[in-house]
Each structure stands twice: as structure tokens, then as C-alpha cells.
């Protein structure tokens, strides 16, 4: 197993609709054809998997149907979008990239993107 550099933004603010997007870029040392991308969340001294997708270079990322993540790939960049976020989901979201094929296997872990989620204030009742 070999190490690989992964870059991602330090901070992202989710939209009022609970959607956050960021780019995960990896420095591929070779010509990988199969790549696995995993988004992890670190909070309260625990790391949990948010979503994961394996894709063939040049093809679209495919997350599970019930995943809160969507994404697109372009070269060594993956554009990730996480939806359905609430204030309680604020935390450090880490991009993990694995070059699965061909060998050798490479593993890269980003420094994490702190995603801040602010629940929208409910609209006040109006007489109009």
C-alpha cells in the first residue's frame, strides 16, 4: 500500500437547504482505472462513513440510491455534494481516495473539510 496526497477545502458552509459541495482532488501517481471515494465524518471522537462510491475513470460516480451524496468526476478531481444536512451534522468531512486497480494500491486521505450547517429560521406567521 502506498500513500497519496488528497486536497480538499478547509471550510464549506452548507446552503439554507442543507446542501454542501466541495472538490476532492487527488495526486494520482499512475494511470488508475478504478477509484473508490469515501466520505467520512469525524465528530465527537468518532469517525463514521457518510457515503462511498467506486467508479471507473471516465465514468460517472454512482452512489447507492439512498445515499445523501452525489458526485461527478473529472480527471483527478471529484466534485462531491452532500444533501439533507442539519445543524447537528456540522463536523469535519474527510475525503478518502483509494486507487483500486491496477496495482499497486494507493490510499489518500484529505485533511478534512469543516462543514457548517445552520438550520434555517422558520418564517414567522403572517396575517397577509
Amino acid at each position: 500500500c502506498k500513500a497519496m496526497h488528497v486536497a480538499q477545502p478547509a471550510v464549506v458552509l452548507a446552503s439554507s437547504r442543507g446542501i454542501a459541495s466541495f472538490v476532492c482532488e487527488y495526486a494520482s501517481p499512475g494511470k488508475a482505472t478504478e477509484v473508490r471515494v469515501t466520505v467520512l465524518r469525524q465528530a465527537d471522537s468518532q469517525v463514521t462513513e457518510v457515503c462511498a462510491a467506486t467508479y471507473m475513470m471516465g465514468n460517472e460516480l454512482t452512489f447507492l440510491d439512498d445515499s445523501i451524496c452525489t458526485g461527478t468526476s473529472s480527471g483527478n478531481q471529484v466534485n462531491l455534494t452532500i444533501q439533507g444536512l442539519r445543524a447537528m451534522d456540522t463536523g469535519l468531512y474527510i475525503c478518502k481516495v483509494e486507487l483500486m486497480y491496477p496495482p499497486p494500491y494507493y490510499l489518500g486521505i484529505g485533511n478534512g473539510t469543516q462543514i457548517y450547517v445552520i438550520d434555517p429560521e422558520p418564517c414567522p406567521d403572517s396575517d397577509f
Epitope: Q42, S45, V47, T48, I109
Partner: nanobody, 126 residues
Framework: EVQLVESGGGLVQPGGSLRLSCAAS????????IGWFRQAPGKEREEVSC????????NYADSVKGRFTISRDNSKNTVYLQMNSLRAEDTAVYYC???????????????????WGQGTQVTVSS
Amino acid sequence: EVQLVESGGGLVQPGGSLRLSCAASGGTLDYWSIGWFRQAPGKEREEVSCISGTGLRTNYADSVKGRFTISRDNSKNTVYLQMNSLRAEDTAVYYCTGKLLHPSLWSACANEYDLWGQGTQVTVSS
């Protein structure tokens, strides 16, 4: 809250083997840096081995190199210390320790640890 629980200690003859386990309750050890320390009677606590959060890096004290092997099984939420060719001087209480570092340090061992288990006694004697 995560707690660490050691097991696998006991009495073994010189030259024998033991495998210590460090299991987590109340959470997972995924990506945690885990260390094994030991303390013999009348001696200072010393770090024996550690494994990084990714499992890619392992370190060993000179006194156990080539005899001890640390590994992790995330599916079992457990870190192991395989101890071979045990000597009388390996007799001690062995402690499992852990810390979840920033992701930029997941490939490294921690310099200090937040969490400590209660320890398990290892006695090497004929």
C-alpha cells in the same frame, strides 16, 4: 463514550506466545491511533508498540522488535498485540491506549493518548 478493554494476558513460559486484544465498547476504533504500553513493578511505564489510524504505520520499542507484532481488525473493532519469544523481562501490566487524531495525522502514531484501558497482566515465568 468509547472505553478500551484489554484481554489475553496470563502466565506463559519463556519462549512462549500470547496475543493481547484491545477492544472498544461504546464506539469504534476506526482511524484511531492505538498504542500498547507496559509497566513492570518498580519501573516506569514504557511504550511497546503503536499502530496508526490507517494501519499503514507501526512502531516498536527496540526491546520487542522482531518478537511483537501489532495489527488491527476494524471489522472486529479490535487491535491485537501478538507477542512471541517471550522473556522474563516482558513481565508487566500491558495497557491499551488510543487517540483519534486530526485526519492529517491518521498515517502517524500519536505522541500522547487520551484514552487508557485498565490493563492486563502478562507474566513470563517457568
